[in-house]
Interface confidence: low
């Protein structure tokens, strides 16, 4: 939207004659008709597509035209348009003689035309006036013209509407080309988005006014860049909200289970090596010469049970001595004088002769060991259960009792709750140490994304007869996808009963 302005400055018709050559009596009472139209390489007759305007009588024969000239005429003449300025135009200015006061075309004699000028060309929008002078054999017209945009219209073609505002819908002023210039503290296509506190996390924080940083659920801190861990998380941190990722040495849902007793309590004495063996449990590997759960006891040399086959140990100044039972000899009573005839195998072991009966070997039943099957096997000593599983001896077998979330003979397998695809409507499943959590797509919520959140136009359930509702563009539109047998914008008509239209 804009205005073509034409400023008539001076008209000269010294001889006071009409275009036909006839003289005006007593002089040519001159008024102007202006026709503005689209660009024509050749300006030809036809509608004034961009507008037309007439002046009152401005003078007789030769005269200057002042600004806002008397007689009710406006100078400059205004030709408003409400379309995109094309940048080109054709202009026809006709000077007419008015013998009387009635200036309507039908009231004038057919030869009342004094002169007619036609120009065309390109004309960019701008404040600058273009000065032109057109002469004919009998007349001369000096005038200037320009195109300016209406209030709130901008750009080369006055096609960009821009109205400065500072309210809920935007906070901006307008640039000369019609683009928006946001007020300080605002951004976005229409400057409707506040610029949050510098550094405020893009996803985790937001603001409703400039320089603010309001944290979304699960986030905290001045810049909303610190996640809030699971409520009750003791020795853990998070990288996303409600997580509880345990610090080293801690376990359990709330990271309150001590898995690194060694580091936290240093229970092993006398330079022993500590190994964590489960929650609040540990094993000390003693240095030579020490014993006890925590290696707190100094060993006598007999403490290592060096005497075999039931030999008894005696401490001596320079070491120890083994007192062997009947049938055994050697430094550690390791040699036997027994044969199978002496029934040396305990606990149901079977005796096998060796060296033509001069010696023997015992084959032990399950759960027993030793050269005479004298020792019971503890199958749990090797800590066979992974992931904090508890080892139990069950007759000849050992069994691992697994912690929640683990399975397998050795508790080596993690049970994935996500394997069952528990999240509905395309939700993404995340395994936790105990259980799972679903991240839901837009429009769904609930532990398993099973709850549909109504959105926009479809929220009111406009579609009938089991039709599916789709939100359209803009979001306050909807489209109903009708099931077989129904028609209508809301699937309200059965096919067998067509709607009655009013035409």
């Amino acid at each position: 939207s804009g205005v073509f302005q034409l400023q008539l400055q001076e008209f000269a018709n010294e001889r006071g004659v009409l275009a036909s050559g006839r003289r005006c009596e007593p002089g040519c009472r001159t008024f102007f008709r202006v026709c503005l139209k689209h660009f024509q390489a050749v300006v030809s007759p036809g509608p004034c597509t961009f507008g037309s305007v007439s002046t009152p009588v401005l003078g007789t024969n030769s005269f200057a035209v002042g600004d806002d000239s008397s007689g009710g005429g406006r100078n400059p003449l205004q030709l408003p348009f409400n379309f995109t300025w094309p940048g080109t135009f054709s202009l026809i200015i006709e000077a007419w003689h008015a013998p009387g006061d009635d200036l309507r075309p039908e009231a004038l004699p057919p030869d009342a035309l004094i002169s007619k000028i036609a120009i065309q060309g390109s004309l960019p929008v701008g404040q600058k006036w273009l000065l032109d002078e057109q002469t004919s054999p009998l007349t001369r017209l000096r005038y200037s013209y320009r195109v300016i945009c209406s209030d709130n219209y901008y750009g080369d073609s006055c096609s960009r509407l821009c109205k400065k505002r500072n309210d809920h819908f935007g906070h901006y002023v307008c640039q000369p080309d019609g683009s928006l210039s946001c007020l300080p503290g605002w951004t976005g296509e229409y400057c409707e988005q506040p610029v949050c506190l510098s550094g405020c996390h893009e996803q985790n924080g937001y603001c409703s006014k400039p320089a603010e940083c309001i944290c979304r659920p699960g986030w905290q801190g001045r810049l909303c860049n610190e996640c809030i861990p699971h409520n009750g998380c003791r020795h853990g941190t998070c990288s996303t909200p409600w997580q509880c990722t345990c610090d080293e040495g801690w376990g359990g849902l709330f990271c309150d289970q001590d898995l690194n007793y060694c580091t936290h309590h240093s229970p092993c004495k006398n330079g022993a090596t500590c190994s964590n063996s489960g929650q609040r449990s540990y094993t000390c590997t003693c240095r030579p010469g020490y014993t006890g759960v925590d290696c707190e006891l100094e060993l006598s040399e007999c403490d290592s049970n060096p005497c075999r086959n039931g030999g008894s140990c005696k401490d001596q100044e320079d070491g120890y001595r083994c007192l062997c039972p009947p049938g055994y000899y050697g430094l550690h009573c390791e040699h036997s004088t027994l044969t199978c005839a002496d029934s040396p195998c305990f606990n149901g072991g079977s005796c096998q002769e060796r060296n033509q009966g001069a010696s023997y070997a015992c084959e032990c039943p399950p759960n027993f060991t030793g050269s005479n099957c004298e020792k019971k096997v503890d199958r749990c000593t090797s800590n066979p259960c992974a992931n904090g599983g508890q080892c139990l001896n069950r007759g000849p077998n050992r069994v691992c009792r697994c912690r929640p979330g683990f399975t397998g003979a050795h508790c080596e397998l993690h049970i994935s709750d996500c394997a069952r695809s528990p999240c509905a409507h395309g939700g993404t499943c995340h395994d936790l140490e105990t259980g799972f959590v679903c991240t839901c797509p837009a429009g769904f919520s609930g532990r398993r994304c099973e709850v549909r959140i109504p959105t926009e136009a479809c929220a009111s359930g406009p579609c009938l007869n089991g039709a599916t509702c789709y939100t359209g563009l803009p979001p306050d539109n909807f489209v109903c996808n009708c099931p077989y047998g129904f028609v209508g914008s809301r699937c309200e008509f059965p096919v067998s009963m067509p709607p009655s239209f009013p035409w």
């Epitope: 689209h38 660009f39 024509q40 390489a41 050749v42 030809s44 094309p86 080109t88």
Partner: antibody, heavy 114, light 106 residues
Framework: QVQLKESGPGLVQPSQTLSLTCTVS????????VSWVRQPPGKGLEWMGG???????DYNSALKSRLSLSRDTSKSQVFLKMNSLQTEDTAIYFC????????WGHGVLVTVSS | DIQLTQSPASLSASLDEIVTITCQAS??????LAWYQQKTGKSPQLLIY???SLAGGVPSRFSGSRSGTQYSLKISKLQVEDTGIYYC?????????FGSGTKLEI
Amino acid sequence: QVQLKESGPGLVQPSQTLSLTCTVSGISISIYGVSWVRQPPGKGLEWMGGIWGDGSTDYNSALKSRLSLSRDTSKSQVFLKMNSLQTEDTAIYFCTLSGDFDYWGHGVLVTVSS
Amino acid sequence: DIQLTQSPASLSASLDEIVTITCQASLDIGNWLAWYQQKTGKSPQLLIYGATSLAGGVPSRFSGSRSGTQYSLKISKLQVEDTGIYYCLQHYRAPFTFGSGTKLEI
């Protein structure tokens, strides 16, 4: 400056439909009309039809039953569709700015042959 | 439909001569007649519009005139580059019509 450019197939089978596009730049086709003119090899100019600024159309009486003109003002394009082509429709097809016909495209040669 | 009868169909003239081509309209078409020159392999070029007005960039040796429903194109002081085919066109009432053309050789 004002420019017109015709585009379309150079060869069309007899009885098939011809589709041509005239792309106009430098001027708005929602204000100015565009006409199609053709010229068989070695012959004179024939006005085929025009589509005016307001979207209305006029056609050459002899071609009216086969010819259809349309436009897409957003793309500044005018379209010609003519069906049931015969060998005598072989010609250079021009688009031109209606009015004084003061701007013309370079033309596109369409040959109707099997 | 309005008919335009153009004559002659062809003519040959020498350098610096004057030639006139005419177009007779079957109805009154006012000044809504234009003249075009077409050279081999080129698009037509506007010479005269509104029956008598010279188009921009056209040499002043070309001129147009009207007498009732007869329209004339006059070329004075013929030049080599004036070789071509000349057409008249009425755009007073659709369907618009061209004259049959006049082939000018220098």
